[in-house]
Amino acid sequence: KFSKQSWGLENEALIVRCPRQGKPSYTVDWYYSQTNKSIPTQERNRVFASGQLLKFLPAAVADSGIYTCIVRSPTFNRTGYANVTIYKKQSDCNVPDYLMYSTVSGSEKNSKIYCPTIDLYNWTAPLEWFKNCQALQGSRYRAHKSFLVIDNVMTEDAGDYTCKFIHNENGANYSVTATRSFTVKDEQGFSLFPVIGAPAQNEIKEVEIGKNANLTCSACFGKGTQFLAAVLWQLNGTKITDFGEPRIQQEEGQNQSFSNGLACLDMVLRIADVKEEDLLLQYDCLALNLHGLRRHTVRLSRKNPIDHHS
């Protein structure tokens, strides 16, 4: 519960925070758990404790292990654990999963990528940023304070972003790199006045008496998740449920999201055992959302059965 995972690369600076919090005046003692050996506070040591922080300047693979911090408060001691792993530098460009910080998402309107853990270090701007190991260049990329801003984000901007900065401790400089994935969310959805794709306005649908018939009402309402959108059928201006004809039922079709991102709905009207009187009814396909209502009317006409006799 009171443990936190930290990782870094050999020959880089790594600063780790004690998972237990307290007041600035509380004493914090650090120990290497495996040996129970106290971590020195003198800054001349490569690994030293500085209050809530444990500093590896620079880190070595052999530093890996569990470190115990004890925050000494007036009434009780709060113990926390920092699980530290130092990895060898990869010769290739690929950043393994175990070196990745949490993934962040961006969209056209918000494309900030924060440099992970940077608040622990004494650094000065500017940050250097890399995507898939390539230095980022061009006016679309702006390093601002501790984050990267990407203008006009596109899906191709998804990938692994590495920030690189210099930590300064008593005049000595140490390099730090941190990598996280960036994913691009679809742009914010929008809502339009309903557009009915089928049936066409005043369409005549041919049906065979005695057979079953299906009519599909299909409409699109905009892009992305829609707050309120519905498609339905009416018979002579009356809801299907109120019309009282058990042979005629409506059934929700597939919610569709086309490749162009449009959010569309289908409603299928099923007429069992078509009768003559069904030809006299007016069938209305209704599509409605917050913008309003659109109606397309269909009528049925008799289709003569194909004569198979010679």
């Epitope: 519960k1 009171f2 237990r20 007041k23 005046s25 000494r72 007036p74 608040d119």
Partner: antibody, heavy 116, light 113 residues
């Protein structure tokens, strides 16, 4: 500069729950714990609990145990206090206050009124 | 729980007066580990948010006028306003900043004569 901005006033019925948010800015959120303090009209300040914002571990005052839940969202630099089974005596101004030597930084307060 | 008892509960004084508010805790607020007294003083003006004046029993928060001072150790503490000003009209609270649950005194309401 350090700022703590709380959510707006709430009116609740007895038995309901209320959730108050506290958005921090101007400092690194996970470096400091966050306390919640309330003040009923004309009464003294009353500490409700605090949360370790780094690991999400809350500590509650005995008077509120079982009714209060303090959480945080580090990505939004926001702490939350939820109080359930509200009664009329929970009518108060609720404050978030950053941990430190004393509470140097406070939210503006959120008035919660419990009335049938 | 540590009980915090403030006195007086209210007082009225003239501009320029020296004002003293006392606070007693039911247990010592001195931490032997660093010799700090974990006691804080706050000022709360009507309808406003509490403002930290003093922490560690005697350390003035930055920006707080020098007329405010804190003293005491263990269980007995004092807040002194050396020369009362009209803007000091407020309720003053002491707080146990030593152990959970953090507790506050009942407050001292300071009025200007």
């Amino acid at each position: 500069q350090v700022q703590l901005v709380q959510s707006g006033a709430e009116v609740k019925k007895p038995g309901a729950s209320v959730k108050v948010s506290c958005k921090a800015s101007g400092y690194t959120f996970i470096n400091y714990g966050m306390n919640w303090v309330r003040q009923a009209p004309g009464q003294r300040l009353e500490w409700m609990g605090w949360i370790n914002t780094y690991i999400g571990e809350p500590t509650y005052g005995d008077n509120f145990k079982g009714r209060v839940t303090i959480t945080r969202d580090t990505s939004a630099s926001t702490a939350y206090m939820e109080l359930s089974s509200l009664r009329s005596e929970d009518t108060a101004v609720y404050y978030c206050a950053r941990e430190g030597e004393g509470f140097a930084y406070w939210g503006q307060g959120t008035l919660v009124t419990v009335s049938s | 729980d540590i009980q915090m008892t403030q006195s007086p509960s209210s007082l009225s004084a003239s501009v320029g007066d020296r004002v003293t508010i006392t606070c007693k805790s039911s247990q010592s607020l001195l931490y032997s580990g660093n010799q700090n007294n974990y006691l804080a003083w706050y000022q709360q003006k009507p309808g406003k948010v509490p403002k930290l004046l003093i922490y560690g029993a005697s350390t003035r928060e930055s920006g707080v006028p020098s007329r405010f001072s804190g003293s005491g150790s263990g269980t007995d503490f004092t807040l002194t306003i050396s020369s009362l000003q009209p803007e000091d009209l407020a309720t003053y609270y002491c707080q146990n900043d030593h152990s959970y649950p953090y507790t506050f005194g009942g407050g001292t309401k300071v009025e200007i004569k």
